[in-house]
C-alpha cells in the first residue's frame, strides 16, 4: 500500500532571464527512493539515480543544474518555460509518486523598466 505523499512548491512565478528552484519532498513512507525524474510536458529534463547520480538531458544541459538535494534549478528562464513540471519519485517497494509544480515566467515589469527613465 502506498502511504507516501509528495509536497511541492506548488504554483510559483519567476522573472524572465532569472532562475528558479523546483523542489519536491516525499514524506510519510519508508520506501527507498531509487530515482527521481524531473519532467516537463513529457520531456525528461533530468534524473537523479541513487546508483549513478545526476543526468541532465542533452537538450537542457545549458539551462538546468542539479540540486539542491533532489531539486532542480532552471536558469536563464524564458516565457516558453511557463507550464507544468513534474517530479516523479520511483520508490521500492511502493512504486511511483508524482508531484506537480506550475511555473509562470513573467516579463520584467513595465514599472521597473519605466523607473530607469525620466520624462523631460
Amino acid at each position: 500500500m502506498m502511504t507516501g505523499t509528495i509536497e511541492t512548491t506548488g504554483n510559483i512565478s519567476a522573472e524572465k532571464g532569472g532562475s528558479i528552484i523546483l523542489q519536491c519532498h516525499l514524506s510519510s513512507t519508508t520506501a527507498q527512493v531509487t530515482q527521481v525524474n524531473w519532467e516537463q510536458q513529457d520531456q525528461l529534463l533530468a534524473i537523479c539515480n541513487a546508483d549513478l547520480g545526476w543526468h541532465i538531458s542533452p537538450s537542457f544541459k545549458d539551462r538546468v543544474a542539479p540540486g539542491p538535494g533532489l531539486g532542480l534549478t532552471l536558469q536563464s528562464l524564458t516565457v516558453n518555460d511557463t507550464g507544468e513540471y513534474f517530479c516523479i519519485y520511483h520508490t521500492y517497494p511502493d512504486g511511483t509518486y508524482t508531484g506537480r509544480i506550475f511555473l509562470e515566467v513573467l516579463e520584467s515589469s513595465v514599472a521597473e523598466h519605466g523607473a530607469r527613465f525620466q520624462i523631460p
Epitope: 530515482q35 525524474n37 525528461l44 533530468a46 534524473i47 539515480n49 546508483d51 549513478l52 547520480g53 545526476w54 543526468h55 541532465i56 538531458s57 542533452p58 544541459k61 543544474a65 542539479p66 520511483h90
Partner: antibody
Framework: QVQLESEGGLFKPTDTLTLTCTVS????????MSWVRQAPGKGLEWIGI?????NTYYANWAKGRFTISKTSTTVELKITSPTTEDTATYFC????????????WGPGTLVTVSS | DIVMTQTPASVEVAVGGTVTIKCQAS??????LNWYQQKPGQPPKLLIY???KLASGVPSRFSGSGSGTEYTLTISGVESADAATYYC????????????FGGGTEVVVK
Amino acid sequence: QVQLESEGGLFKPTDTLTLTCTVSGSSLSSSYMSWVRQAPGKGLEWIGIIGSNGNTYYANWAKGRFTISKTSTTVELKITSPTTEDTATYFCARGGYRTSGMDPWGPGTLVTVSS
Amino acid sequence: DIVMTQTPASVEVAVGGTVTIKCQASQSISSYLNWYQQKPGQPPKLLIYDALKLASGVPSRFSGSGSGTEYTLTISGVESADAATYYCQQEHSVGNVDNVFGGGTEVVVK
C-alpha cells in the same frame, strides 16, 4: 556531440586496449555514458555504464576484464587481455539506465584482435 | 537477470505496408523500453523511448506500445528509408544482466 577518439585497428591478445570517448560541448559531471559493442554481422551488445558520480555497472560477461573510467570530458574503456571474441565496433553513447534512451552515439571504432 | 527476446529476426515489407516488431522481457520492465534503428556502417539512432514516446525528429509513422513484459514497435506506411535493423533495449535494471538489448530485427523493404 559525442566523438569516439581512439586508435582502432589491430591488437594482439597480449595488449591492453584503451578506447577514449570525448564529449564536446558539455561536461560529464552531470551525464551517464554507456559503452556498447557490435561484432561484425551481429547485434548490439551492452558492455557497461558509468554515472556522473563515477559509479559503474557492467554486463555479467564484461566484469573483471573491462574497466570504464572518466574525466570531466572523456570516458575510457580499458580491455585487458583481449581475445579474438573482442573483435567488434565499439560505440560510446550518452545516457542509459532510465535516462529515456542512449542519445547521441559516437560513430564507433573497429577493433580487431588477432594473434 | 532480465533477458530481452525480439521477434521476428527478419521481416520483409512492401513500400506503404505496415511492419510490427515485438520485444518480450523475461520480467516486468515497467515501460523502461527504448527502440533504436541502425543502418549499415552507422551507429544506432534512438527512435522511441519509455515504450511509446517519439524521439526528437522521428517521423510519426513510427509508434511504440506495450507495458509489463510485452512491447511492440510499429512502422506504418513503410518507406524505403526504413530498411534497417531495429533493436529494443530495456532500461529497468543494469545489475546482473548479460545484455540490455534484444537480438535485433532486420526490416527489408521491397
